[in-house]
């Protein structure tokens, strides 16, 4: 079944942008001016998820790349990774659970909770130039709030 998708950028609540760091990792850092063109453009898709009153299930792909953010166990710890997929089959309405994030929107701030690992969130560090990761705490040192801006093609 076809899915609704959009193209966007994400910035954390400290206004750090997300950029590629090697082929399979994202990092967060402050960008200005022409450097803003480095930021990753996501293709966010509305997918099937578990029923909820305040969470919207989405998948986060990298625009025009066959890469999706996914959540897997590594060394017994929930971990965020970029995973290659067959572009002929993605995005799809019924995404595998590791690709699904529950988008939680409060006061124009977005959180992305892993559907596979409840209460684990896409996170950034306070420090500059550090990897984007899956964090198990909210409201602590690490940042779990993001803002989204549409990208015009």
């Amino acid at each position: 079944a076809p899915v609704r998708s959009l193209n966007c950028t994400l910035r954390d609540s400290q206004q750090k942008s997300l950029v590629m760091s090697g082929p399979y990792e994202l990092k967060a850092l402050h960008l200005q001016g022409q450097d803003m063109e480095q930021q990753v453009v996501f293709s966010m898709s509305f997918v099937q998820g578990e029923e909820s009153n305040d969470k919207i299930p989405v998948a986060l792909g990298l625009k025009e790349k066959n890469l999706y953010l996914s959540c897997v166990l590594k060394d017994d710890k929930p971990t965020l990774q970029l995973e290659s997929v067959d572009p002929k089959n993605y995005p799809k309405k019924k995404m595998e659970k590791r690709f699904v994030f529950n988008k939680i929107e409060i006061n124009n701030k977005l959180e992305f909770e892993s559907a596979q690992f409840p209460n684990w969130y896409i996170s950034t560090s306070q420090a500059e130039n550090m990897p984007v990761f899956l964090g198990g705490t909210k409201g602590g040192q690490d940042i779990t709030d993001f803002t989204m801006q549409f990208v015009s093609s």
Epitope: A1, V3, L6, E51, S52, I56, N108, Q149, F150, S153
Partner: antibody, heavy 119, light 108 residues
Framework: EVQLVESGGGLVQPGGSLRLSCTVS????????MSWVRQAPGKGLEWIGI???????YYASWAKGRFTISKDTSKNTVYLQMNSLRAEDTAVYFC?????????????WGQGTLVTVSS | EIVMTQSPSTLSASVGDRVIITCQAS??????LSWYQQKPGKAPKLLIY???TLASGVPSRFSGSGSGAEFTLTISSLQPDDFATYYC??????????FGQGTKLTVK
């Protein structure tokens, strides 16, 4: 305060074209999706389509081809281009804001603009 | 495309009555359903989203329930301001968003 104001409605001949505008304030089109919905006289609500970013638009099956939604974020304005108009397109046309991205529901509406297709 | 069917099409009731409007989807939409109220010459107003969550500023006499393909809107004690037309809306089935045909609530 969230405000949406439609304009551009009026009388148009069958086969003609019309472009409606929806100017918004109190929020940014760079982070909210916008739908167009119409209502023929004495009839129910009919969803036309929705725009996210400029490249991501979705339409009701009956609207594909004749109706095009676009936007100019710098002007805070969303447009509905209507071509090959027919008598049955006579309706009040509303723009509406999606409450949250992909929520599908609409928490802010304009007052509507009337389009009459008649010779 | 998913078709939304409301019943009844018209409903006569009195102030203080308990009113129930139903909405059926042609296939399961989980809880992706909203309800709107519309008065003549006005824009619709969002009442309920995700089948059961009350929108901001909506009185608690309104409630929604259901999941899958069967949904209901209940007004526990009808007030004079509630006479209007009510629409259900599928918000999550595929790429398309569809409204029911409406239920007109009139004074008995």
């Amino acid at each position: 305060e969230v405000q949406l104001v439609e304009s551009g409605g009026g009388l148009v001949q069958p086969g003609g074209s019309l472009r409606l505008s929806c100017t918004v304030s109190g929020f940014s089109l760079s982070s909210y999706a916008m739908s167009w919905v119409r209502q023929a006289p004495g009839k129910g609500l009919e969803w036309i389509g929705i725009i996210y970013d400029s490249a991501s638009t979705y339409y009701a099956s009956w609207a594909k081809g004749r109706f095009t939604i676009s936007k100019d974020t710098s002007k805070n304005t969303v447009y509905l281009q209507m071509n090959s108009l027919r008598a049955e397109d006579t309706a009040v046309y509303f723009c509406a804001r999606e409450r949250q991205i992909f929520s599908g529901d609409m928490d802010g509406w304009g007052q509507g603009t009337l389009v009459t297709v008649s010779s | 495309e998913i078709v939304m069917t409301q019943s009844p099409s018209t409903l006569s009731a009195s102030v203080g009555d308990r009113v129930i409007i139903t909405c059926q989807a042609s296939q399961s939409i989980d809880n992706w359903l909203s309800w709107y109220q519309q008065k003549p010459g006005k824009a619709p107003k969002l009442l309920i989203y995700r089948a059961s969550t009350l929108a901001s500023g909506v009185p608690s006499r309104f409630s929604g329930s259901g999941s899958g393909a069967e949904f209901t809107l209940t007004i526990s004690s009808l007030q004079p301001d509630d006479f209007a037309t009510y629409y259900c809306q599928n918000t999550g089935g595929g790429v398309s968003i569809a409204f029911g045909q409406g239920t007109k609530l009139t004074v008995k």
